[in-house]
């Protein structure tokens, strides 16, 4: 049994790090493999992750981690029974993929404005909470040529768009994703999209 592609891991910087790797041939990951991980820190304990299959030769493991902070470094050992297949390390703070924002809501009852709000995916005591900025993607299924990205670089998870900048009488969709500047993260996955109908009409000119 051999590792073809070594494990690579990303952390949500809250509670889960996901490691993926490829084996040299078809493998029943959960039956044949175990990924052991341990924080390099006093009084830490070794934890075991049971991997799942991810395609014929691919395996994925979701490592549960508590109180993830920048200095944390984990040792990783991939075992097949008594055979050590691979040994490595993982520093979560250097491989962060934030959680996707949630609860994206569109408020159209504000005069002349479309207000989009969403929730920060982290609790206030998480270190990413005050570091997230967002990208909001707005597009129209009725108008395939229309797709815009709005960068939200302030902390408040809201975006206001003048309704007059959108075509009247058609539907739009929006989704939002996040990244954390000071942690040099990748972008999160997109949130589920939400749909609304733009009924705004320009005031009739006299």
């Amino acid at each position: 049994m051999k590792v073809l592609q070594e494990p690579t891991c990303v952390s949500d910087y809250m509670s889960i790090s996901t490691c993926e790797w490829k084996m040299g041939g078809p493998t029943n990951c959960s039956a044949e493999l175990r990924l052991l991980y341990q924080l390099v820190f006093q009084s830490s304990e070794t934890h075991t992750c049971v991997p799942e299959n991810n395609g014929g030769v691919g395996c994925v493991c979701h490592l549960l981690m508590d109180d993830v902070v920048s200095m944390d470094n984990y040792t990783l050992d991939l075992w097949a029974g008594q055979q050590l297949l691979w040994k490595g390390s993982f520093k979560p703070s250097e491989h962060v993929k934030p959680r996707a924002p949630g609860n994206l809501t569109v408020h159209t009852n504000v005069s002349d404005t479309v207000l989009l709000t969403w929730s920060n995916p982290y609790p206030p005591d998480n270190y990413l909470y005050n570091d997230l900025t967002y990208a909001v993607n707005i597009w129209s299924e009725n108008d395939p040529a229309y797709s815009r990205i709005h960068n939200v670089t302030y902390l408040k998870p809201t975006l206001r768009i003048p309704a007059s900048t959108l075509k009247s009488g058609i539907s739009y969709r929006a989704r939002v994703r996040a990244w954390a500047q000071h942690y040099n993260t990748t972008w999160s996955e997109w949130s589920p999209s939400t749909k609304w109908y733009n009924s705004y009409r320009e005031p009739f000119e006299q």
Partner: antibody
Framework: QVQLVQSGAEVKKPGASVKVSCKAS????????MHWARQAPGQGLEWMGI????????SYAQKFQGRVTMTRDTSTSTVYMELSSLRSEDTAVYYC?????????WGKGTLVTVSS | QSVLTQPPSVSAAPGQKVTISCSGG????????VSWYQQLPGTAPKLLIY???KRPSGIPDRFSGSKSGTSATLAITGLQTGDEADYYC????????????FGTGTKLTVL
């Protein structure tokens, strides 16, 4: 919200032992390490040791090795620090603090006075 | 146990800026992250800065931290009377066995 509530002040004789408690609430108790530190009157902070509430494993500062014992009770989300063979220089405020490499939440402190 | 060196006291007038230094060595500050704590009279320490320069939620941006080589600095701008307190730097000594160490503490007086 996160709270660390420590037991009340103690007065002990030299040679005795003291056991200070720190009850945690507002978070998942076993998910965060707990440190103990102390501060003698008018002095700075001194680290004593750490306990991992998940499995109960500990690590102590060399200065206190053999004299300090840290334990936890997951049923009550409480950690304990026991210091034995007390001497007058152990008179200090003892703090529990949550965290790993730095400590974001602290108890209010427990004053232990060692006096004959 | 090694201790980080801080000036015993600093002072400045309200509205002014003050800096507090923290000096260590290659086995501690030079090889680890620095945190800063504020201790108001009669209270427990409070985390002000972690990771050399990051602020926890709720700490105003008047407080900032930096690190260069084996020393670190806490800067406080727009001083307020409520900032009068003791300030401690902290880091990890990575010599065996690793352990947290603190600075000697600096008393800030707002004139």
């Amino acid at each position: 919200q996160v709270q660390l509530v420590q037991s009340g002040a103690e007065v002990k004789k030299p040679g005795a032992s003291v056991k200070v408690s720190c009850k945690a609430s507002g978070y998942a108790f076993t998910s965060y390490y707990m440190h103990w530190a102390r501060q003698a009157p008018g002095q700075g902070l001194e680290w004593m040791g750490i306990i991992n509430p998940s499995g109960g494993s500990t690590s102590y500062a060399q200065k206190f090795q053999g004299r300090v014992t840290m334990t936890r009770d997951t049923s009550t989300s409480t950690v304990y620090m026991e210091l034995s063979s007390l001497r007058s220089e152990d008179t200090a405020v003892y703090y529990c603090a949550r965290g790993k490499w730095w400590w974001q939440y602290w108890g209010k402190g427990t004053l232990v006075t060692v006096s004959s | 146990q090694s201790v980080l060196t801080q000036p015993p006291s600093v002072s400045a007038a309200p509205g002014q800026k003050v800096t507090i230094s923290c000096s260590g060595g290659s086995s501690n500050i030079g090889n680890s992250y620095v945190s800063w704590y504020q201790q108001l009279p009669g209270t427990a320490p409070k985390l002000l800065i972690y990771d050399n320069n990051k602020r926890p939620s709720g700490i105003p941006d008047r407080f900032s931290g930096s690190k260069s080589g084996t020393s670190a600095t806490l800067a406080i701008t727009g001083l307020q009377t409520g900032d009068e307190a003791d300030y401690y730097c902290g880091t990890w000594d990575t010599s065996s066995p690793p352990q947290p160490i603190f600075g000697t503490g600096t008393k800030l007086t707002v004139l």
